[in-house]
């Protein structure tokens, strides 16, 4: 902690300006009024203070606002934000998207820090849900943001926010996350026509159930193999050969290259070999012709 020392004569700061960079730490402590600092926070960013000097300025604000900074100060923290701890940030009440943007800008180009994560958490909780504008902002700064959320957190995303999501925002999402996001996307895009709908929904299809994949096969979508390989195995298994053929269109030939990988491998095992043969791709491993396929679920229902 900096010692309380009297400000030397003539050094009392009347405003926050570049002359302060020549002040020693103790002089800053003694000569800069916290209330002045708070009202002129927007100037701090333009002045090349050292890290040590920024520590002093932060200390002054902490003394002035022991319960947490007001948003008028937070919005202009600039690089001083990097000095904040998650504990500091938890005291804040950030409601303005402009404030959030300003602070994210400071951290731009870096991994999401614990401070940023805490800030986002406080902001989203304060808003009650992850609305479209917030999601737009967050994914612009952190494309992987959406996939960093738990399925429970994702459940608070309203369908309208899905419009802000770009394909790259979903690159690192796992199936559990896509299971939550897919129904929201389906709802968000439901009024679009076939081809436009597919373009929008494609990135979310890792959460699609069998019935929706079957329905997509009716729309001439020509799904590429990369998308097909990301589908849930349990959703792909019940698809018939004809449905997969219609779903993939001209891309059906790509099944051969993927026949040893999931979900194609498991799907092949579920099909009759003579049905697979009709594709003319040389896919092997289907149920041999003449074998009876028992539907165990039906048997269980009967017993």
């Amino acid at each position: 902690e900096v010692e309380k020392t009297a400000c030397p004569s003539g050094k009392k700061a009347r405003e926050i300006d570049e002359s302060l960079i020549f002040y020693k730490k103790w002089e800053l402590e003694a000569c800069v009024d916290a209330a002045l600092l708070a009202t002129q926070m927007d100037r701090v960013n333009a002045i090349p203070f050292t890290y040590e000097q920024l520590d002093v300025l932060k200390h002054k604000l902490d003394e002035l606002y022991p319960q947490g900074y007001p948003e008028s100060v937070i919005q202009h923290l600039g690089y001083l934000f990097l000095k904040m701890s998650p504990e500091d940030i938890r005291k804040w009440n950030v409601t303005s998207l402009e404030t959030l943007k300003a602070l994210l800008e400071v951290n731009k180009g870096h991994e999401m820090s614990p401070q940023v994560a805490t800030l986002i958490d406080r902001f989203v909780k304060g808003r009650g849900q992850l609305d479209k504008d917030t999601l737009d902002t967050l994914t612009a700064f952190y494309p992987g943001y959406l996939c960093s959320l738990s399925p429970e957190e994702l459940s608070s995303v309203p369908p309208s926010s899905i419009w802000a999501v770009r394909p790259q925002d979903l690159d690192t999402c796992d199936p559990r996350q896509l299971d939550v996001l897919y129904p929201k996307a389906r709802l968000a895009f439901q009024n679009m026509n076939g081809s436009e709908y597919f373009v929008k929904i494609q990135s979310f299809l890792g959460g699609a159930p069998t019935e929706d994949l079957k329905a997509l096969s009716q729309q001439n979508v020509s799904m590429d193999l990369a998308t097909f390989m990301k589908l849930r195995t349990d959703a792909v298994l019940p698809l018939t050969v004809a449905e997969v053929q219609k779903l993939l269109g001209p891309h059906v030939e790509g099944l051969k290259a993927e026949e040893r990988h999931r979900p194609v491998r498991d799907w092949i095992l579920r099909q009759r070999q003579d049905d697979l043969d009709t594709l003319g791709l040389g896919l092997q491993g289907g149920i041999p012709n003449g074998y009876l396929v028992l539907d165990l679920s039906m048997q269980e229902a009967l017993s």
Epitope: E211, K214, A215, Q218, N220, T240, A242, K246, G249, D295
Partner: antibody
Framework: EVQLVESGGGLVQPGGSLRLSCAAS????????MSWVRQAPGKGLEWVAT????????YYPDSVKGRFTISRDNSKNTLYLQMNSLRAEDTAVYYC??????????WGQGTLVTVSS | DIQMTQSPSSLSASVGDRVTITCRAS??????LNWYQQKPGKAPKLLIY???RLHSGVPSRFSGSGSGTDFTLTISSLQPEDFATYYC?????????FGQGTKVEIK
């Protein structure tokens, strides 16, 4: 062996309603889309409706949209076609058919619907 | 909607004849073209799907060819049980549509 058996056809007045049923057996009903296709006397085949395996999605041609409703009960392995505001031109044999991707691969024997006053 | 036009509307042939029926789509339907056989008073039966693939149990004398808009069903050697009406159907784009049918009669 796949079997589809339609019922519910009969004589109905113009503007009237009728509900057709189709009992399916010999395969896992809930795995497949199902359809209705009709054939007017001495005429060709006309697709009437299709429903997805779980019943979420339905498809109709403009000629019956808003008048006909396709539905299914997977617990009973049964497909339905509710026909309202019937017209003379709806007179036909109605076939239920299993629909696989783009193929009507198995058909029932049909049930005759006659719309006449 | 895609219109499907079959020709001829009817034809007379003898047992053992080679019979060809054509089906034309009003726009490209890739290979999503199916053929059905219907006998009087009976339900249609699937013969060929995806232009050339025989449905299970269908004799090899039936074959199909074509792509895009023009398709053909060929019966290499007509048998007595083949006298029936044949329909083509496109499965490329909703609404699914059928040709008007080709009746194959005994000469």
């Amino acid at each position: 062996e796949v079997q589809l058996v339609e019922s519910g056809g009969g004589l109905v007045q113009p503007g009237g309603s009728l509900r057709l049923s189709c009992a399916a057996s010999g395969y896992t009903f809930s795995d497949y889309f199902m359809s209705w296709v009709r054939q007017a006397p001495g005429k060709g085949l006309e697709w009437v409706a299709t429903i997805s395996n779980g019943g979420t999605y339905t498809y109709y041609p403009d000629s019956v949209k808003g008048r006909f409703t396709i539905s299914r009960d997977n617990s009973k392995n049964t497909l339905y076609l509710q026909m309202n505001s019937l017209r003379a031109e709806d007179t036909a044999v109605y076939y239920c058919a299993r629909f696989d991707g783009y193929i009507f691969d198995y058909w029932g024997q049909g049930t005759l619907v006659t719309v006449s006053s | 909607d895609i219109q499907m036009t079959q020709s001829p509307s009817s034809l007379s042939a003898s047992v053992g004849d080679r019979v060809t029926i054509t089906c034309r789509a009003s726009q490209d339907i890739s290979n999503y073209l199916n053929w059905y056989q219907q006998k009087p008073g009976k339900a249609p039966k699937l013969l060929i799907y995806y232009t050339s693939r025989l449905h299970s149990g269908v004799p090899s004398r039936f074959s199909g060819s074509g792509s895009g808009t023009d398709f053909t069903l060929t019966i290499s050697s007509l048998q007595p049980e083949d006298f029936a009406t044949y329909y083509c159907q496109q499965g490329n784009t909703l609404p699914w549509t059928f040709g008007q049918g080709t009746k194959v009669e005994i000469k």
